[in-house]
C-alpha cells in the first residue's frame, strides 16, 4: 500500500438542510469491498463505526460538521470532504423583498433584501435551480444582495435564510419565496443557465450547500453574473467554498 486510500464521499439524503423534526440520513460511500467505515461528527469530536447515520427527528444537537473515513486492512483512507448538516426552522423566517420591484426590465438593477426579526449577522440567499448559494455577512439586521445589469439568468424563485455566526448550523425557516421576473426578454439558449435544476422545497434540496459564493464587500453594489457553475461574482471578488472554521 503506497499512500493513503482515496477519500469517500459523504452525502445527506434528501438534503443537508433539514427542518427541525424531519428525518435525514447521512451516507458514506467508498469504493467496493470496504472493510469498515467510521463516521465522525465534529465539535465535539465523536465517531460511530457505521457507513450511515439515520437521524429520525432532526434536533439542534444534530446540526454541525460531519466527515467519514474507511479502513481496508490496516490502512485508512483520507477523510471525506466535510458535510455541513444544517437545522432549519430554528428561528422565525426572514422576509425577502426586491427593490425597487420584483419585476425588473432587463439591464436594470435590483436589490434583494433579506430582513430578520433578530439581530442576526449572517444571511444566505438561494435561487431555485442553482447548485450553490449567495452568502453575504452583514453586521446588522438586514442583508442586501445587489444584482446589477439584470439578465434573463436572474429570473427565478429566491428564498433566504438568516442565522447567527455564533451558531452557524442553526438556521431560520426559509423566507417565503420571491419570484424575480425579468421583463423585456429576448431569451436565447445562451442566456439560459446550464446548471442542473432541483426543486426548491427543503425536503428535496440538494444534499450539500457547497460550493458557495461567499461574498463579503462594502455596501456598494456588485455585479453577479451567470455561469455554468451557478451565479458567481465578477472579476475582483473572491469565489470561495463556504466552510466555516472550527
Amino acid at each position: 500500500q503506497s499512500g493513503p486510500l482515496p477519500k469517500p464521499s459523504l452525502q445527506a439524503q434528501p438534503s443537508s438542510l433539514v427542518p427541525l423534526g424531519q428525518s435525514v440520513i447521512l451516507r458514506c460511500q467508498g469504493p467496493p469491498d470496504v472493510d469498515l467505515y467510521r463516521l465522525e461528527k465534529l465539535k465535539p469530536e465523536k465517531y460511530e463505526d457505521q457507513d450511515f447515520l439515520f437521524i429520525p427527528t432532526m434536533e439542534r444537537s444534530n446540526a454541525g460538521r460531519y466527515r467519514c473515513s474507511y479502513q481496508n486492512g490496516s490502512h485508512w483512507s483520507l477523510p471525506s470532504d466535510q458535510l455541513e448538516l444544517i437545522a432549519t426552522g430554528v428561528y422565525a423566517k426572514p422576509s425577502l423583498s426586491a427593490h425597487p420591484s420584483s419585476a425588473v426590465p432587463q439591464g436594470r438593477d435590483v436589490t434583494l433584501k433579506c430582513q430578520s426579526p433578530y439581530s442576526f449577522d449572517e444571511f444566505v440567499l438561494y435561487k431555485e435551480g442553482d447548485t450553490g448559494s449567495y452568502k453575504r455577512p452583514e453586521k446588522w439586521y438586514r442583508a442586501n444582495f445587489p444584482i446589477i445589469t439584470v439578465t434573463a439568468a436572474h429570473s427565478g424563485t429566491y428564498r433566504c435564510y438568516s442565522f447567527s455566526s455564533s451558531s452557524p448550523y442553526l438556521w431560520s425557516a426559509p423566507s417565503d419565496p420571491l419570484v424575480l421576473v425579468v421583463t423585456g426578454l429576448s431569451a436565447t439558449p445562451s442566456q439560459v443557465p446550464t446548471e442542473e435544476s432541483f426543486p426548491v422545497t427543503e425536503s428535496s434540496r440538494r444534499p450539500s450547500i457547497l460550493p458557495t459564493n461567499k461574498i463579503s464587500t462594502t455596501e456598494k453594489p456588485m455585479n453577479i453574473t451567470a455561469s455554468p457553475e451557478g451565479l458567481s461574482p465578477p472579476f475582483g471578488f473572491a469565489h470561495q467554498h463556504y466552510a466555516k472554521g472550527n
Epitope: P4, L36, R38, K41, L42, K43, P44, E45, K46, Y47, E48, D49, R65, S69, Q71, S74, W76, P79, N246
Partner: antibody
Amino acid sequence: QVQLVESGGGLVKPGGSLRLSCAASGFSFSDHYMSWIRQAPGKGLEWVSSVGSEGKFIDYAASVKGRFTISRDNAKNSLYLQMNSLRAEDTAVYYCARHYREFRWHYYYFDYWGQGTLVTVSS
Amino acid sequence: QSVLTQPPSVSGAPGQRVTISCTGSSSNIGAGYDVHWYQQLPGTAPKLLIYGNSNRPSGVPDRFSGSKSGTSASLAITGLQAEDEADYYCQSHDLGAHVWVFGGGTKLTVLG
C-alpha cells in the same frame, strides 16, 4: 464503579512473548472502545493499540504493528494484548483504558484507566 | 519524540497560576480534534483532568481550566496547591492514520 485490572506482566527475554489481560467491571464493557497505553520508566505516555466495541475496528501504533495483537472477549468482559518479538524498548507499564461513550457515539479520550502492569524485556 | 509538544517542566509557588502548553499540527489539533488533559500523580495511573478542550469531569476543581486555539492548547492551574505536583499530559487524535497521540508530559513542581 468502573474498574479495570491489568495482569500478565513480568520479565521476558528479548524475542519472547507475553499476553496481557484486562478485566473490566462496573460498566457495559461491550459498549466501549478500549485501548492499551504504555509508559516506559521515567518517560511519557504512548498509545499502543485500540479495539472497537465489537472487536472489528483495530488500530496499532507504528512501533508495535506486526508484533502486537489486541483482542477482546465481550462475554468475559476482558481485553487482551498478545505481545510477540518483544524488544528492550517495549519495557513499560501497560495500562488498559476505556474510551468515553455517550448514546451511540464514541469519543477520542480515555475516561478510566487501570493501575497498569509492568512488562520488563531484558536478557 | 512525541507528536504533541509540551514543555518538560513548569513550576510555581503555592497560590500562583501556571500554564502548560501543548502544540500539535494540522493533522491533529489543527484538523479540528479536541485536546484532552490527564494528571498523573506520583506512582499512580493517569486520571482524566480536562476533556473536549475545556470541560472538567465531576470532581475536578475549577482551578483547572483548558483552552484550544489553532494547532495549540493550554492547561491553566490557578491557586496552585502542593497536591497539584504531578505530571500532566495532553492528548488528541491524528487524522492521518486515526491514531491517538500524547504530548511528552510536563512535570509540575510546586515550590516551597
